[in-house]
């Protein structure tokens, strides 16, 4: 079922409040049964970062995994937890941060030469439609099959952000993921949506560039929660990120 947050695939190594997927004004799309598409360019957000209940890893951000917050805790109460960095203990690939995978119970770098199948730095989407055959382990792993070794330009197809040239990220555009420009100061950005019904966001924006964060535009503070416009703004203070 489509109860998950559809995160901005290919957006890596950022705290969940940054980056995200963007809806797009109407396009005539006919998709597999049960798939919803966004109507209008709305940016639904919540302001304060809160633990997000989940049933599986795909409902969490790319820097998170789904698990019980306490050791041996009730499996029925699971939340999105911060991913585990290199050399931390793990039980499955999804627990490790992008660019790492779980080997012998430890998160190790996926760019080590002995590991031929690169770990997808972005979550391979499993939207719960009839065609999806991905299982819990294969969701985060994909064999790279780039046809060339140069970094992708704008409009190049990509599987992960590391396929793209500097200043670009890998984000979804209809049926492909392509290299798009990282957002500059003042450009509209999208926060992860964590509540309500989630339409399938088939267009995705990149995250904000270095030194910028995605925040509510000052003159939009009075707007309703569902229509607040977010833009990339200069850091004034360090953004919080949950740890465990």
């Amino acid at each position: 079922t489509l109860n998950s947050v559809l995160n901005s695939n290919a957006i890596k190594n950022l705290p969940p409040p940054l980056g995200g997927a963007a809806g797009h004004p109407g396009s005539a799309v006919s998709a597999a049964p049960g798939i919803l598409y966004p109507g209008g360019n709305k940016y639904q957000t919540i302001d304060n970062y809160q633990p997000y209940p989940c049933a599986e890893d795909e409902e969490c951000g790319t820097d998170e995994y789904c698990a019980s917050p306490t050791r041996g805790g009730d499996a029925g109460v699971q939340i999105c937890l911060a991913c585990r960095k290199r050399r931390k203990r793990c039980m499955r690939h999804a627990m490790c941060c992008p660019g790492n995978y779980c080997k012998n119970g430890i998160c190790v770098s996926s760019d080590q030469n002995h590991f031929r199948g690169e770990i997808e730095e972005t979550i391979t989407e499993s939207f719960g439609n009839d065609h999806s055959t991905l299982d819990g382990y294969s969701r985060r792993t994909t064999l790279s099959s780039k046809m060339y070794h140069t970094k992708g330009q704008e409009g190049s197809v990509c599987l992960r952000s590391s396929d793209c040239a500097s200043g670009l990220c890998c984000a979804r555009h209809f049926w492909s993921k392509i290299c798009k420009p990282v957002l500059k100061e003042g450009q509209v950005c999208t926060k992860h949506r964590r509540k309500g019904s989630h339409g399938l966001e088939i267009f995705q924006r990149c995250y904000c560039g270095e030194g910028l964060s995605c925040r509510i535009q000052k003159d939009h503070h009075q707007a309703s929660n569902s229509s607040r416009l977010h833009t990339c703004q200069r850091h004034h203070h360090h953004h919080h990120h949950h740890h465990h």
């Epitope: 499993s126 439609n129 065609h131 790279s144 409009g155 555009h173 209809f174 798009k180």
Partner: antibody
Framework: EVQLVESGGGLVQPGGSLRLSCAAS????????ISWVRQAPGKGLEWVAS???????YYPDSVKGRFTISRDNAKNSLYLQMNSLRAEDTAVYYC???????????WGQGTTVTVSS | EIVLTQSPATLSLSPGERATLSCRAS??????????INWYQQKPGQAPRLLIY???KQGSGIPARFSGSGSGTDFTLTISSLEPEDFAVYYC?????????FGGGTKVEIK
């Protein structure tokens, strides 16, 4: 070398059905979007259907409800099930994929579908 | 849907001449900092071949004499010096929105 080979075309009566296949090789088939594009005799190109690497499907209004695109990643194959065929569906059908660029950058040689009584 | 209009319908030129083909969209095909316009070449009895993607970027193995330019609604494919093998039909395509649409084509023929 990337190869796309279509098959299954032929002569069919209006209202009939046909199933086209496209055998892919030379790339990790399951990771990439793949599409059908057609060209009526002496006419231009028309997009028919696409399926993403993660399985959702897209159609224009002209074929919606009549055509179904599907993929079998285990067999590296793409299919187009065409039902309720009309004379205006007569065309060369190409499968095309987007491997390097957000465009149809690799094409098969095409298979001809003729709808006529 | 986005309608693409190509002009001229036919271009009669000699080898060595410069060819300028136009593609106009009914609305902007720019988004996310990218022009979602592609150009293809098709010869009789053959499948189309990608020349230019994202408005101005060359496809793999495409000769440098082919270049694309433009933004928003107006795009141009330029062949700097026509070779005998360049006489063909050229199509523009937009991939900003579904359904993807193609222009009606420009036939470049030998004068």
């Amino acid at each position: 070398e990337v190869q796309l080979v279509e098959s299954g075309g032929g002569l069919v009566q209006p209202g009939g059905s046909l199933r086209l296949s496209c055998a892919a090789s030379g790339f990790t088939f399951s990771s990439y979007a793949i599409s059908w594009v057609r060209q009526a005799p002496g006419k231009g190109l028309e997009w028919v259907a696409s399926v993403s690497g993660w399985g959702d499907t897209y159609y224009p209004d002209s074929v919606k409800g009549r055509f179904t695109i599907s993929r079998d990643n285990a067999k590296n194959s793409l299919y187009l099930q065409m039902n309720s065929l009309r004379a205006e569906d007569t065309a060369v059908y190409y499968c095309a994929t987007s491997l390097q660029n957000y465009a149809f950058d690799y094409w098969g040689q095409g298979t001809t579908v003729t709808v006529s009584s | 849907e986005i309608v693409l209009t190509q002009s001229p319908a036919t271009l009669s030129l000699s080898p060595g001449e410069r060819a300028t083909l136009s593609c106009r969209a009914s609305e902007s095909v720019d988004d996310f900092g990218i022009s979602f316009i592609n150009w293809y070449q098709q010869k009789p009895g053959q499948a189309p071949r990608l020349l230019i993607y994202a408005g101005s970027k060359q496809g793999s193995g495409i000769p440098a004499r082919f270049s694309g330019s433009g933004s928003g609604t107006d795009f141009t494919l330029t062949i700097s010096s026509l070779e005998p093998e360049d006489f063909a039909v050229y199509y523009c395509q937009q991939l900003k929105e579904v359904p993807p649409t193609f222009g009606g084509g420009t036939k470049v023929e030998i004068k």
